[in-house]
Interface confidence: low
Amino acid sequence: KFSKQSWGLENEALIVRCPRQGKPSYTVDWYYSQTNKSIPTQERNRVFASGQLLKFLPAAVADSGIYTCIVRSPTFNRTGYANVTIYKKQSDCNVPDYLMYSTVSGSEKNSKIYCPTIDLYNWTAPLEWFKNCQALQGSRYRAHKSFLVIDNVMTEDAGDYTCKFIHNENGANYSVTATRSFTVKDEQGFSLFPVIGAPAQNEIKEVEIGKNANLTCSACFGKGTQFLAAVLWQLNGTKITDFGEPRIQQEEGQNQSFSNGLACLDMVLRIADVKEEDLLLQYDCLALNLHGLRRHTVRLSRKNPIDHHS
């Protein structure tokens, strides 16, 4: 469940974040899953752990495998898995599907292409951008911070875009490339008042004390790129990150899915080791966009285990 796919090219830097999040003060231990061997933290090693990050400087094909990270706090441990695959560099220009990051869509109004995973690296501007392996030239293309802006987007701008940058670690430089597809939307998008698909309003969810529980907040907002759209969970009117209960976590990130062409977002609330006091809380799934806010409230109730003696 708390597993993340990561990939890179041999002889490039690859930095992987532990899929389990914790406060900066928590310690994170990394292991190579197949051998249960601890990953060193000394920076002189080619592969080393640095808190929530696992660094391959540079990566080798033999590094491929599953890595375990354990986030340790005084009161709990959380385990995550990073499934790392390092590929050989392609001799031709074609970027295979397995090296592609998520596709982004653009329109005349909004044509930003973000460089995937760049936030994990210690890089300095400018980024280099390539389309179908050709360096981008001309005033229509502007490399701005961690993204590329294309002015006056046309359908011909669709294609595979690669960003290239340098990661610096203790004075040593390592190259990183990342590729994603860019599609151009012809049809006009629209936005609707948020529609929450789950949970139902005033839903009662049965949970077992001591077990884990998941609540999904899912809402759709219209068609095409949505601005100012978000789904989130609140506990007793407080944002999860402010509530301060480490057992209750919002799944990191929001997935923008397109079912029947609609732009939808999901946010999963994970409650570990359900306790009696969790039943007293009010769980609000909030969906917001530029039309307004919709709120669905969920309460938890105890699922009575079947008494086999009665």
Epitope: T241, L290, H291, L293
Partner: antibody, heavy 116, light 107 residues
Framework: QVQLVQSGAEVKKPGASVKVSCKAS????????MHWVRQAPGQGLEWMGI????????SYAQKFQGRVTMTRDTSTSTVYMELSSLRSEDTAVYYC?????????WGQGTLVTVSS | DIQMTQSPSSLSASVGDRVTITCRAS??????LNWYQQKPGKAPKLLIY???SLQSGVPSRFSGSGSGTDFTLTISSLQPEDFATYYC?????????FGGGTKVEIK
């Protein structure tokens, strides 16, 4: 402890512009929507608009459309509200407030006086 | 835009009194209604969100009820520090709109 600290009072002439800042501290800046609300002397509260600090997208009340611009600077965790073509009826205390449907943290307010 | 009508616009009451303020929306807003308290020279303070949920740190003498178009804020036993202006606000639709306010004064 979450705090929203606004810039100081301003006196402006009719037709001028004013830019009010609101610096957030104590939590992840981009995780919260920021609203701007104003209150004319002795009057009620009036919502002006909202900005998503994460992407910078905005939604403005129709009344202020074309006159108001809300921006943010993620490097300093600051949001800005600029109101142009000021008139005497824009004299008010301007508040930034954080939240989604309900705003549970407010700045201390910035008094903007428009007078010739 | 959704109009919010608050009543009364002002009221006089004594410490210990039960006080009720009503707010009506021009169209259904589900439970997306919030109540704020404001004292002179200060920023508003959130009391109740989602019509009936008490904001953390707010005394339990404050309560909210209602759904759809009609909402009520009740102060079960008025305290000296409760003399202030109270505003309702709909959080259902942009633009967000506030009621005109209710000033609670000492009798």
């Amino acid at each position: 402890q979450v705090q929203l600290v606004q810039s100081g009072a301003e006196v402006k002439k009719p037709g001028a512009s004013v830019k009010v800042s609101c610096k957030a501290s104590g939590n992840t800046f981009t995780a919260y929507y920021m609203h701007w609300v104003r209150q004319a002397p002795g009057q009620g509260l009036e919502w002006m608009g909202i900005i998503n600090p994460s992407g910078g997208s905005t939604s403005y009340a129709q009344k202020f459309q074309g006159r108001v611009t809300m921006t943010r600077d993620t490097s300093t965790s600051t949001v800005y509200m600029e109101l142009s073509s000021l008139r005497s009826e824009d004299t008010a205390v301007y508040y930034c407030a954080r939240g989604v449907g309900a705003t549970n943290y407010w700045g201390q307010g910035t008094l903007v006086t428009v007078s010739s | 835009d959704i109009q919010m009508t608050q009543s009364p616009s002002s009221l006089s009451a004594s410490v210990g009194d039960r006080v009720t303020i009503t707010c009506r929306a021009s169209q259904g807003i589900s439970n997306n209604l919030n109540w704020y308290q404001q004292k002179p020279g200060k920023a508003p303070k959130l009391l109740i969100y989602a019509a009936s949920s008490l904001q953390s740190g707010v005394p339990s003498r404050f309560s909210g009820s209602g759904s759809g178009t009609d909402f009520t804020l009740t102060i079960s036993s008025l305290q000296p520090e409760d003399f202030a202006t109270y505003y309702c606000q709909q959080g259902f639709n942009f633009p967000l709109t506030f009621g005109g306010g209710t000033k609670v004064e000492i009798k």
